[in-house]
């Protein structure tokens, strides 16, 4: 029950996160004109990954797409790439996780397959979230650098008395949406990976069977099964797969292939 809840919650959190990453990528307000300590302008500038916009106090808004690819700063291209990679990985992760959900039955899919898919989607969500956080952070760093550069020469003298105001840009709403969304996707991914552990059948869980040969004492050997020191035709340690159920004989549990998360 707890596993199903963890998996379901991880899925929902990741879904919200990826929706947020998509929203942030599409938003125009990655950077907005800094209004602090600036003359009151009747024009407000803001920029996104794909276009820049100008909103006039009259209410008229005009947006222009960046129709050049080569003319754009490398950092902006990198941010675009990170966000797109994040969205693609997240989308694939969502698709995989839908089929991995414990509450959804698809044919005769085994729990081990669901565990694998849950782990895969979890890892995808983690990478997706990290891509979004990295993309937003790179952009934020770019803004901070440019902000202080433009502050240094905020007013550029033009012929003595005439001055031109340098437009400075600060963090836009999309950055905060991106950070939160990336964080949610990351958390969702971690939850999926945790859920995967609960879904994974213990492949090396064996019912301990002891065989008694007359006149010999039974020696208890650690290692998940009891071994006999008796003679006879069946002195081999017999391994019986218990299908995931544990007996009180099992003192030591073995790491399964999903335990490295």
């Amino acid at each position: 029950m707890a596993v199903t809840a963890c998996q379901g919650l991880g899925f929902v959190v990741s879904l919200i996160g990826i929706a947020g990453i998509i929203a942030a990528t599409c938003m125009d307000q990655w950077s907005t004109q800094d209004l602090y300590n600036n003359p009151v302008t009747a024009v407000f500038n803001y920029q996104g990954l794909w276009r820049s916009c100008v909103r006039e106090s009259s209410g008229f808004t005009e947006c222009r797409g960046y129709f050049t690819l080569l003319g754009l700063p490398a950092m902006l291209q990198a941010v675009r790439a990170l966000m797109i990679v994040g969205i693609v990985l997240g989308a694939i992760g969502l698709l995989v996780s839908i089929f991995a959900l414990k509450c959804i039955r698809i044919g005769s899919m085994e729990d081990s397959a669901k565990a694998n898919m849950t782990l895969t989607s979890g890892i995808m969500f983690i990478v997706s979230g990290l891509c979004a956080i990295a993309g937003v952070s790179v952009f934020a760093n770019m803004l901070v650098t440019n902000f202080w550069m433009s502050t240094a020469n905020m007013y550029t003298g033009m012929g003595g008395m005439v001055q031109t105001v340098q437009t400075r840009y600060t963090f836009g709403a999309a950055l905060f949406v991106g950070w939160v969304a990336g964080g949610l996707t990351l958390i969702g991914g971690v939850m999926m990976c945790i859920a995967c552990r609960g879904l994974a059948p213990e492949e090396t869980n064996y019912k301990a069977v002891s065989y008694h040969a007359s006149g010999h004492s039974v020696a208890y050997k650690p290692g998940g099964f009891k071994a006999s020191t008796g003679f006879g035709s069946n002195t081999k340690n017999k391994k019986i797969y218990d299908g995931g159920a544990r007996t009180e004989d099992e003192v030591q549990s073995y790491p399964s292939k999903h335990d490295y998360v």
Partner: antibody, heavy 118, light 113 residues
């Protein structure tokens, strides 16, 4: 057809108050920024105040700040200018205008005359 | 506040002649976001409210004859009437539309010679 009709002007004593109104029609008033501009007799144009659409930010000329208040009623398609502590230098024709592309004032009313005199 | 300096203050021109009116602002009216200059030109005939001619320094308002044109960038702007008509006799104002307060120039009175 866009129409802006001012009213409320008249003769008032110094220190007195007056409320100008502007009835707008022919365009989506709630989506438009609107302004008041005045012109003293035989003088040039002087921007007085603006109010934006949406959150309704207000802006004032230094000469009227603290004395004049611009407001709007989108339900009535009306713009107002509450003028307090009037001075002789406030005597002018007051125009109601619509701000559009480039923040330019593309439509103007015929104006209402305000005279401040003892 | 932004100071708008118009010149000349008055002008007497013969019909058919080319007219140029200058307007200088104390700060640049160029917005880096869209590379547009926030300056407007108005025409006011006696007894009438002003009429918008040009916005964004060079964009002609609809219905304005093409003999009117605006040019300039940053701080220096010009209104040109390519061939003066009798009905163009008026006072012309430039206005800063970039910074509040939205200041006007003192005006240029255009008369027929």
């Amino acid at each position: 057809e866009v129409q802006l009709v001012e009213s409320g002007g008249g003769l008032v004593k110094p220190g007195g108050s007056l409320r100008l109104s502007c009835a707008a029609s022919g365009f989506t008033f709630s989506n438009s920024a609107v302004s008041w501009v005045r012109q003293a007799p035989g003088k040039g144009l002087e921007w007085v105040s603006s109010i934006t659409s949406g959150v309704s930010y207000t802006y004032y000329a230094d000469s009227v700040k603290g004395r004049f208040t611009i407001s709007r009623d989108n339900a009535k398609n009306s713009l107002y200018l509450q003028m307090n502590s009037l001075r002789a230098e406030d005597t002018a024709v007051y125009y109601c205008t619509r701000q559009f592309k480039g923040n330019a004032l593309d439509y103007w009313g015929q104006g209402t005359s305000v005279t401040v005199s003892s | 506040d932004i100071v708008m300096t118009q010149s000349p203050s008055s002008l007497s021109v013969s019909p058919g002649e080319r007219v140029t009116i200058s307007c200088k602002s104390s700060q640049s009216l160029l917005n880096s976001g869209n590379q547009k200059n926030y300056l407007a030109w108005y025409q006011q005939k006696p007894g009438q409210p002003p009429k918008l001619l040009i916005y964004w320094a060079s964009t002609r308002e609809s219905g304005v004859p093409d003999r009117f044109s605006g040019s300039g960038s940053g701080t220096d702007f010009t209104l040109t009437i390519s061939s003066l008509q009798a009905e163009d006799v008026a006072v012309y104002y430039c206005q800063n539309d970039y910074f509040y307060p939205l200041t006007f120039g003192a005006g240029t009175k255009l008369e027929l010679k």
